[in-house]
Structures are given as C-alpha cells and as structure tokens.
C-alpha cells in the first residue's frame, strides 16, 4: 500500500510541477520593472522568455514578441533551452509514469518492467526539475547582474542637467512559479525513485518443490525467510499464483507467463 501511495503521490506532485514549469515558461512576467524609485508609474514594463510587454495606466497592454533568434542574448537562449528540455523530459516522464503506475494494469506487464519504468520516470522528473530550477536561476542571476549594472549607471547626466533614467528590472512572478514548480517536479521524481525500490523484485521466487528426505516429511522451499513468509500467518490480501503466494504491496516476483489479470 505504501509503495502505491508513494508512486501515486510522486506522479501527482510531478504532474503539478510540470504544469507549473509549462506555466512559468509561457508567462510574460519573468522580469518586471523595478518600482523602487517611482512606485506610481504611468508605464509598466515586464518581460518574458518569448515577448516583452508594456502596460499603460490607461489599461492598455502591448506585447511584442522577440522575432529575432540570433539577436537575443545567449543567456536567454540558454534559459529557453533549459525550460524546453525540462518540459519535454517532464512530459515523457509523465507518459512513462502513467504506464508504470501500480494501480493501472496493462496486459501482462511484469513488475520488473513497472519498476524500471518508475525509476526512468523518476529520473526524468528529477532532471526536468533541475532543468527548470537551473533555467530560472540563470535568469535570476542575469537580472541581478543587470540590476546592479543599471543602478551604477542609473543617471547619465547631459551636462548635469538632464536625467536619463534607465529602466531596471527585478524578479517577476514567473521566477517564483518556476522555482516552486521545479522543486515539486524534483520531489515527485525522488518519490518515484523511492517507489521503484519498493516495486523492484529483490529475489527470484522459484516454484516450490518438495524434497522428501528419508524418514522425514520436511518441505523445503528455496527463498529463505522472505519466501516462507508467503505461507505464514499473514494471509491478508493474498493472491495465489502458480509457484507461491504474495501480498499486493510486498516485494513481488516476476509473474509467470500464465499469469493474467
């Protein structure tokens, strides 16, 4: 039961995380105009990965896409790439994890295959989360660097008379969405990896064979304690298969070719 819960929760957390990464990537507010000097602005600027926007106090908002590809800063291109890689890996991870879910039975899929798929999706979620966190962090670092550079050059005087105020940008909502979403995807991935350990068969359960020693009626079953517990007092949730018994959430053996659900 714990394995199913861990796997299911990991999937849900990752799903929320990836949805958040997609939302952050699409959001326009990666950087917003710093209003420290003038909190009452008639023109408010904010920028995303794909376009920059200007909101006027009339209520009108105008957004312009970055139609150039070569003219964009390398860092912005890197952030875009990291976020897209994160989304792609996350989406593939979600697809894989759907089939890996213990509560979903697909044909005669072996538990080892489910365990492998769970691990694969978990790793994908971890990498996806790391990509998102890295992308957002690179952008944040870029903002901090530019912020202090523009603060240093804030007022460039023309004969000391005219002030040209450079627009400074600070962290936008998308950065926080991205960090949280990346973190959730990472946590979800870790949970999937933990669930994988519970799904993976730790030994092969052979068919029980009785060896009759002379003068004794002792049944010998290979597999030691783990195997024998299948026949012990724990009879709850038993599913009898050809070659032994096991509970649904205990360490599972490979089903035989005759096992169908």
């Amino acid at each position: 039961m714990a394995v199913t819960a861990c796997q299911g929760l990991g999937f849900v957390v990752s799903l929320i995380g990836i949805a958040g990464i997609i939302a952050a990537t699409c959001m326009d507010q990666w950087s917003t105009q710093d209003l420290y000097n003038n909190p009452v602005t008639a023109v408010f600027n904010y920028q995303g990965l794909w376009r920059s926007c200007v909101r006027e106090s009339s209520g009108f908002t105008e957004c312009r896409g970055y139609f150039t590809l070569l003219g964009l800063p390398a860092m912005l291109q890197a952030v875009r790439a990291l976020m897209i890689v994160g989304i792609v890996l996350g989406a593939i991870g979600l697809l894989v994890s759907i089939f890996a879910l213990k509560c979903i039975r697909i044909g005669s899929m072996e538990d080892s295959a489910k365990a492998n798929m769970t691990l694969t999706s978990g790793i994908m979620f971890i990498v996806s989360g790391l990509c998102a966190i890295a992308g957002v962090s690179v952008f944040a670092n870029m903002l901090v660097t530019n912020f202090w550079m523009s603060t240093a050059n804030m007022y460039t005087g023309m004969g000391g008379m005219v002030q040209t105020v450079q627009t400074r940008y600070t962290f936008g909502a998308a950065l926080f969405v991205g960090w949280v979403a990346g973190g959730l995807t990472l946590i979800g991935g870790v949970m999937m990896c933990i669930a994988c350990r519970g799904l993976a068969p730790e030994e092969t359960n052979y068919k029980a064979v009785s060896y009759h020693a002379s003068g004794h009626s002792v049944a010998y079953k290979p597999g030691g304690f783990k195997a024998s517990t299948g026949f012990g007092s724990n009879t709850k949730n038993k599913k009898i298969y050809d070659g032994g018994a096991r509970t649904e959430d205990e360490v599972q053996s490979y089903p035989s070719k005759h096992d169908y659900v």
Epitope: A42, V43, F60, Q163, V165, Q166
Partner: antibody, heavy 120, light 113 residues
Framework: DVKLVESGEGLVKPGGSLKLSCAAA????????MSWVRQTPEKRLEWVAY????????YYADTVKGRFTISRDNARNTLYLQMSSLKSEDTAMYYC?????????????WGQGTSVTVSS | DIVMTQSPSSLTVTAGEKVTMSCKSS????????????LTWYQQKPGQPPKLLIY???TRESGVPDRFTGSGSGTDFTLTISSVQAEDLAVYYC?????????FGTGTKLELK
C-alpha cells in the same frame, strides 16, 4: 458621441469642502481610466488625480494628496472628486478627462470644466 | 517630478507660415520596453477645454489635420505646423505621460500678426 459633463462648481471658504461630479456618456465608461485636471487662473494645467477603469488604482498629485478623493461609480457612469480642506491655490477650472485606451496615457476627451473658487 | 519646459512662450505668425515650437523634459520620456516616447501635445482654444493633438510624441490623433507633426525623442520634442491656418491660433501644451505626476509644460501661445 463621447460626452463628459462636470458639475458641482461653487465658491467655497478656505478649509471648506466640495464634491465635483462628471457624468459620462457615449462610451463604455467602465472600460476607461479617468483623470481630473485643473487649470489655474494663470492658465497653467495641473494634473490632479487618476483612477483606473475598475477603480483599483488611484494616484494623486502631491499638492492634493490627503485632501482630495477620486472615485467612480461604473453603474452610474459617473466620476467624482471629493475636495476637502480647500486652499486658495485650489482655485481653478476643473476638467474631467478620459484616458485614451491605446496611446500612452493621453487624454483624448475632456469635459467643458467646472469652476471652483476658494476665497474668504 | 518631471519638469516640462516649453519655448517660446508666445509666437506671432502670419497665415501659411511654418511654425515650430519646442518642449524639453527634465528626464527622458523614452520607454525602453517599447521604444515609445511618452509625450503628448494638446491644443487649447479660448474658452474651450484642451484637445488632444499628438500622442507617443509623433502619432497624430484621428481627425487632426496632417499639417500638425510631432517629432523628437528622449528629452527634446518639437511640434511643427507646416502651414498655419487662422483656426490654429491657440495655446499648445506638451505633457509628460511617462511618470506620475503627469506634468504639463507652461504652454506656447500662437498669435496672428
């Protein structure tokens, strides 16, 4: 046809109060940000206050902050300016204006104005 | 606050003449986000409210004759009337639309010779 009609003019003693109204017609009032602008007897134009279309953003000129209150009733298509603690320097012609929906923060329509005189 | 300085304070012209008036701001009105200059020009005739002529420093309001042209960027702006007509006699104000408080210039009065 866009129409802005101000009302509430009067002669007030210093320290007194007055409420100006601006009735809007000919456009979707709730979609536009509005402003009050005054013109002094010396013909200087001074921006007084701003209110966003939904009334959630409000800005004032430093000279009137804490004394004047801008508000709007979108159901009645009316803009208001509540003036209190009036000073002689508040004597002016008060215009209500509509901010152009697209194009900076330019005021594309103005009312005919209402006169406010603060004198003892 | 952004200070708007207009010059000259008055202009005496003859009909058909080309006129230019200047407006300078104490801070740049150019917004880096969209590369637009947030400066507006208004015309005010005696006994009337101001009328919008030009916004974004150079965009003519609909219905405004094409003899009116706005130009300039950053801190220096110009309003040009290519051929003055009798109905153009008025006071012209420039306004900072970039930051609150929105500030107006002192105006340039256009008079007929």
């Amino acid at each position: 046809d866009v129409k802005l009609v101000e009302s509430g003019e009067g002669l007030v003693k210093p320290g007194g109060s007055l409420k100006l109204s601006c009735a809007a017609a000919g456009f979707t009032f709730s979609s536009y940000a509005m402003s009050w602008v005054r013109q002094t007897p010396e013909k200087r134009l001074e921006w007084v206050a701003y209110i966003s279309s939904g009334g959630d953003y409000i800005y004032y000129a430093d000279t009137v902050k804490g004394r004047f209150t801008i508000s709007r009733d979108n159901a009645r298509n009316t803009l208001y300016l509540q003036m209190s603690s009036l000073k002689s320097e508040d004597t002016a012609m008060y215009y209500c204006s509509r901010l152009r929906l697209r194009g900076g923060n330019a005021m594309d329509y103005w009312g005919q104005g209402t006169s406010v005189t603060v004198s003892s | 606050d952004i200070v708007m300085t207009q010059s000259p304070s008055s202009l005496t012209v003859t009909a058909g003449e080309k006129v230019t008036m200047s407006c300078k701001s104490s801070q740049s009105l150019l917004n880096s986000g969209n590369q637009k200059n947030y400066l507006t020009w208004y015309q005010q005739k005696p006994g009337q409210p101001p009328k919008l002529l030009i916004y974004w420093a150079s965009t003519r309001e609909s219905g405004v004759p094409d003899r009116f042209t706005g130009s300039g960027s950053g801190t220096d702006f110009t309003l040009t009337i290519s051929s003055v007509q009798a109905e153009d006699l008025a006071v012209y104000y420039c306004q900072n639309d970039y930051a609150y408080p929105l500030t107006f210039g002192t105006g340039t009065k256009l008079e007929l010779k």
